[in-house]
C-alpha cells in the first residue's frame, strides 16, 4: 500500500504520458487521477513503466472501481493485464471478442495462466456456449484450448463451430473428450462427399463407434496407421479381417509393427487366424482353425 | 534485452551504457532507461519514443545524460557525462509497445 501524500505542487498529472515514469510510487498516487487513467488507459501500454509503477496504477483503477472494471477499461489493459489476479478477473464482464482478443495477445507465446484461463471462463459462460468466432479465436492463441476441456463443457460446443478445429488443436484430447466431440464433427461435416469427409473427420475418429469404422471401410478411404491406433478399442474390435483391409488400404502392412500395442494386439486376438493369415502380413496370435469362438455378451442379451 | 557500457568510473567521467534487443524489432518500442541503487526505489532516468523524436529526463540528470536510439543497429543508448557518486546504480532498460520487454541490468559504480 503507498500512503496517501498530497501531490506536490506542478505535479498534477494532467495526462497519462511519458513523465510518469519518472514519478515516484508515492507521486503516482497523489498525482494521477484514476478517471483520468480510466479514459486513458490506452496510453499505459506505450509507456515503459516499472511492474512497481504499474501496481500503483493497478490500485488506483482497484478504488476506482472496486465491482469491478467497466469493459471500456478492461479492453485497454494491455499489459497491465498481467497484474491481475484470477479474483480481479472473476468481478468483470467480458463480452466482447475484441477485448478478449486484445488481452490474449497481451499473453500471447506463453502458457496459459491462470488469469487467462478465468479469463476465457467468465468469456465463455457469458456467451453461453463455445460458438465458432470464439473457439476460432481461442485455438488460434492456445492450440490445447479444446482439449483442456471437460467433456461437460465440450457438450456446449455447437455442432457449427467444429469447422474451426484444426487436427493439432486435438493432439492432447482423450478419449472421452472425443467421444463427446465425434457426434458434433459428423454433424457438422455430414453434407461433404466422401474423401472431403475423411479428411475432416479423420482427427476426430478417436471418438467414433464401430459402425461408423464399418461405413467408413466401404468408401476407400485409406486410413493411415497413426490414425487406425487413435481408435477405440472397443470400436475396432468387432471389425473383420476384409473391413480392416478395406479401411487401411495399403496401410494395412503397417499392422505388422504395431502387432504388440493396442488396439492392433487386441484386435489380432479377436481374429480367426487363417482370416489373419490372408493378409500375408505374418500377423500371429488370431484364434486357431477349428475352434469355435461363443460371443457370451450375445447369449446373455438373448437369455 | 540486454544492457551493456557499465563498469566503474571517477566523479566527473563518461560512460555510454547500450540496449540491445534480440529476437524482436526495437522500432516500434518506446525505451525507458530506470537505475536502482541499493535499498532504494528504482527510478525513471530516461525515456526516448518509438520514433526517437521524444526524449525526457528526470530532473537529477538533465543536461548531463543523453538517450539515442540507432532502429538499424537494434539498440537504444545512454550516454552519461559528469558522472556523480549519487549515479551509482544498477542501469536497466524496459521497452513497451505491443509487449514488454525488461533487461537484466548493467551495474554502474561512481567512485
Known amino acids: 500500500e503507498v500512503e496517501k501524500t498530497a501531490c506536490p505542487s506542478g505535479k498534477k498529472a494532467r495526462e497519462i504520458d511519458e513523465s510518469l515514469i519518472f514519478y515516484k510510487k508515492w507521486e503516482l498516487e497523489a498525482c494521477v487521477d484514476a478517471a483520468l487513467l480510466a479514459t486513458q488507459m490506452d496510453r499505459v501500454n506505450a509507456i515503459p513503466f516499472t511492474y512497481e509503477q504499474l501496481d500503483v496504477l493497478k490500485h488506483k483503477l482497484d478504488e476506482l472501481y472496486p465491482q469491478g472494471y467497466p469493459e471500456s477499461v478492461i479492453q485497454h489493459l494491455g499489459y497491465l493485464f498481467l497484474k491481475m489476479s484470477p479474483e480481479d478477473i472473476r468481478k468483470w464482464n467480458v463480452t466482447s471478442l475484441e477485448t478478449l482478443k486484445a488481452l490474449l495477445e497481451v499473453n500471447k507465446g506463453h502458457e496459459m495462466s491462470p488469469q487467462v484461463a478465468t479469463l476465457i471462463d467468465r468469456f465463455v459462460k457469458g456467451r453461453g456456449q463455445l460458438d465458432k468466432d470464439t473457439l476460432d479465436t481461442l485455438t488460434a492463441f492456445y492450440p490445447g484450448y479444446l482439449c483442456s476441456l471437460s467433456p461437460e463443457e465440450l457438450s456446449s460446443v455447437p455442432p457449427s463451430s467444429i469447422w474451426a478445429v484444426r487436427p493439432q488443436d486435438l493432439d492432447t484430447c482423450d478419449p472421452r473428450q472425443l467421444d463427446v466431440l465425434y457426434p458434433k464433427a459428423r454433424l457438422a461435416f455430414q453434407n461433404m462427399n466422401g474423401s472431403e469427409y475423411f479428411v475432416k473427420i479423420q482427427s476426430f475418429l478417436g471418438g467414433a463407434p464401430t459402425e461408423d469404422l464399418k461405413a467408413l471401410s466401404q468408401q476407400n478411404v485409406s486410413m493411415d496407421l497413426a490414425t487406425f491406433m487413435k481408435l477405440r478399442t472397443d470400436a475396432v474390435l468387432p471389425l473383420t479381417v476384409a473391413e480392416v483391409q478395406k479401411l487401411l488400404g495399403p496401410h494395412v502392412e503397417g499392422l505388422k509393427a504395431e502387432e504388440r500395442h493396442r488396439p492392433v494386439r487386441d484386435w489380432i486376438l479377436r481374429q480367426r487366424q487363417d482370416d489373419l493369415d490372408t493378409l500375408g502380413l505374418g500377423l500371429q496370435g488370431g484364434i486357431p482353425n477349428g475352434y469355435l469362438v461363443l460371443d457370451l455378451s450375445m447369449q446373455e442379451a438373448l437369455s | 534485452l540486454v544492457e551493456s557500457g557499465g563498469g566503474l568510473v571517477q566523479p566527473g567521467g563518461s560512460l555510454r551504457l547500450s540496449c540491445a534487443a534480440s529476437?524482436?524489432?526495437?522500432?516500434?518500442?518506446?525505451i525507458g532507461w530506470f537505475r536502482q541503487a541499493p535499498g532504494k526505489e528504482r527510478e525513471g532516468v530516461s525515456y526516448i519514443s518509438s520514433s526517437g523524436d521524444s526524449t525526457n529526463y528526470a530532473d537529477s540528470v538533465k543536461g548531463r545524460f543523453t538517450i539515442s536510439r540507432d532502429n538499424a543497429k537494434n539498440t537504444v543508448y545512454l550516454q552519461m557525462n559528469s558522472l556523480k557518486p549519487e549515479d551509482t546504480a544498477v542501469y536497466s532498460c524496459?521497452?513497451?509497445?505491443?509487449?514488454?520487454?525488461w533487461g537484466q541490468g548493467t551495474l554502474v559504480t561512481v567512485s
Open positions: 529476437g524482436f524489432t526495437l522500432d516500434y518500442y518506446a
Open positions: 524496459a521497452a513497451a509497445g505491443g509487449f514488454r520487454y
